[in-house]
């Protein structure tokens, strides 16, 4: 079955960070093009990346409509030209993707420490509330808007002169940590969704140190 001289896509893989979601597949096309369809379990199929010679398709616009839905995509292979000239054996070849639930599976992007301010023996550390591509009422929602209290941040901090790390957790985007007066500290943050079974943690934010320009810390 399928169309002569076409091969089915394989290795269909979801790549998603902070809901920016791209479907990737193989092989690079030779004498064929691809069209992607996406659907929820209960919905209709919608075509995207029509007759593309790429091996990836940005499906963000579709999945952000409801990030808690489960999506399935499929990639069709069509011959590079009309079927009358290339020969046809009925319906085109296609391959299904794994199911993908953005809310449960999108990778958490690397956080950024937005600011830190020391007052006496307290330091207030603020993690940037990153904007996502999820919209509500025509505005883009932040990561906190989407995940609410499901999202926590862990802060790892230590005296610049030692290697022993302490941790703090928050279900907002701010930490208030105790420090010794006159001592320089370094810290990095990590986004975590404890309720998840996969992709629970983000990569670490860049390390920031008190008394240095942001981003200039060298280990």
């Amino acid at each position: 079955s399928g169309t002569t001289n076409t091969v089915a896509a394989y290795n269909l893989t979801w790549k998603s960070t902070n809901f920016k979601t791209i479907l990737e597949w193989e092989p690079k096309p030779v004498n064929q093009v691809y069209t992607v369809q996406i659907s929820t379990k209960s919905g209709d199929w919608k075509s995207k990346c029509f007759y593309t010679t790429d091996t990836e398709c940005d499906l963000t616009d579709e999945i952000v409509k409801d990030v808690k839905q489960t999506y399935l995509a499929r990639v069709f292979s069509y011959p590079a030209g009309n079927v009358e000239s290339t020969g046809s054996a009925g319906e085109p070849l296609y391959e299904n993707s794994p199911e993908f639930t953005p809310y449960l599976e999108t990778n958490l992007g690397q956080p950024t420490i937005q600011s830190f301010e020391q007052v006496g023996t307290k330091v207030n550390v603020t993690v940037e509330d990153e904007r996502t591509l999820v919209r509500r009422n025509n505005t883009f929602l932040s990561l906190r808007d989407v995940f609410g209290k499901d999202l926590i941040y862990t802060l790892y901090y230590w005296k610049s002169s030692s290697s022993g790390k302490k941790t703090a957790k928050t279900n907002t985007n701010e930490f208030l940590i105790d420090v010794e007066k006159g001592v320089s500290y370094c810290f990095f943050a990590q986004a975590v969704i404890p309720s998840r079974t996969v992709n629970r943690k983000s990569t670490d934010s860049p390390v920031e140190c008190m008394g240095q320009e942001k981003g200039e810390f060298r280990e």
Epitope: F50, F76, N82, V83, P92
Partner: antibody
Framework: QVQLVESGGGVVQPGRSLRLSCAAS????????MHWVRQAPGKGLEWVAV????????YYADSVEGRFTISRDNSKNTLYLQMNSLRAEDTAVYYC????????????WGQGTLVTVSS | DIVMTQSPDSLAVSLGERATINCKSS????????????LAWYQQKPGQPPKLLIY???TRESGVPDRFSGSGSGTDFTLTISSLQAEDVAVYYC?????????FGGGTKVEIK
């Protein structure tokens, strides 16, 4: 010889619906992707929608997405365009066109059917 | 979306003279793996549908007179009518078929001077 004949155009009020048809003959209809292209009076060409030879995949211009539906009946050698929630800016001559040597290269066009959306 | 920009909007040329129409795409329509430019040219006479002249930027459709030629690559393309005939009076459109949505240039009206 290849022939594409559109029908179904006419005058319609804003918000109403219309269905265009394109009857194909002289070629193996089921083997070709088909498109709708429109041309507003005195203006240029605007691609509207495409459907693959098998009818499985369809794609639309942003300007008509969610309002227009392209479909085909390969047993009847006919292409359709269901147009809902019509607007004044949809007023145009609507052409059906056949994919030629490659997808999106139109080697044959119909003569067009005029759709006028006016109250 | 790829934006196609044609120039000039209109062109008056004497019979037997050369007519040159330019088309610029907002991004490349060259597909590197087959080295083809996904660009076509159409001719439209009053009251008629468009007619395919050129595809792959420079390949003439069968039956098209050889006075019509296409050239260019990447983002800049040209349609040339080497010796204008009376029957060539029409509007000419470029179109990219590299990626969807398919887009056309605004058209160039060719008249006789």
């Amino acid at each position: 010889q290849v022939q594409l004949v559109e029908s179904g155009g006419g005058v319609v009020q804003p918000g109403r619906s219309l269905r265009l048809s394109c009857a194909a003959s002289g070629f193996t209809f089921r083997s070709y992707g088909m498109h709708w292209v429109r041309q507003a009076p005195g203006k240029g060409l605007e691609w509207v929608a495409v459907i693959t030879y098998d009818g499985i995949n369809k794609y639309y211009a942003d300007s008509v997405e969610g309002r227009f539906t392209i479909s085909r009946d390969n047993s009847k050698n006919t292409l359709y365009l269901q147009m809902n929630s019509l607007r004044a800016e949809d007023t145009a001559v609507y052409y059906c066109a056949r994919d030629g040597v490659y997808y999106g290269v139109y080697d044959y066009w119909g003569q067009g059917t005029l759709v006028t959306v006016s109250s | 979306d790829i934006v196609m920009t044609q120039s000039p909007d209109s062109l008056a040329v004497s019979l037997g003279e050369r007519a040159t129409i330019n088309c610029k795409s907002s991004q490349s329509v060259l597909f590197s793996s087959n080295n083809k430019n996904y660009l076509a040219w159409y001719q439209q006479k009053p009251g008629q549908p468009p007619k395919l002249l050129i595809y792959w930027a420079s390949t003439r459709e069968s039956g098209v007179p050889d006075r019509f030629s296409g050239s260019g690559s990447g983002t800049d393309f040209t349609l040339t009518i080497s010796s204008l005939q009376a029957e060539d009076v029409a509007v000419y459109y470029c179109q990219q078929f590299h990626s969807y949505p398919l887009t056309f240039g605004g058209g160039t009206k060719v008249e006789i001077k």
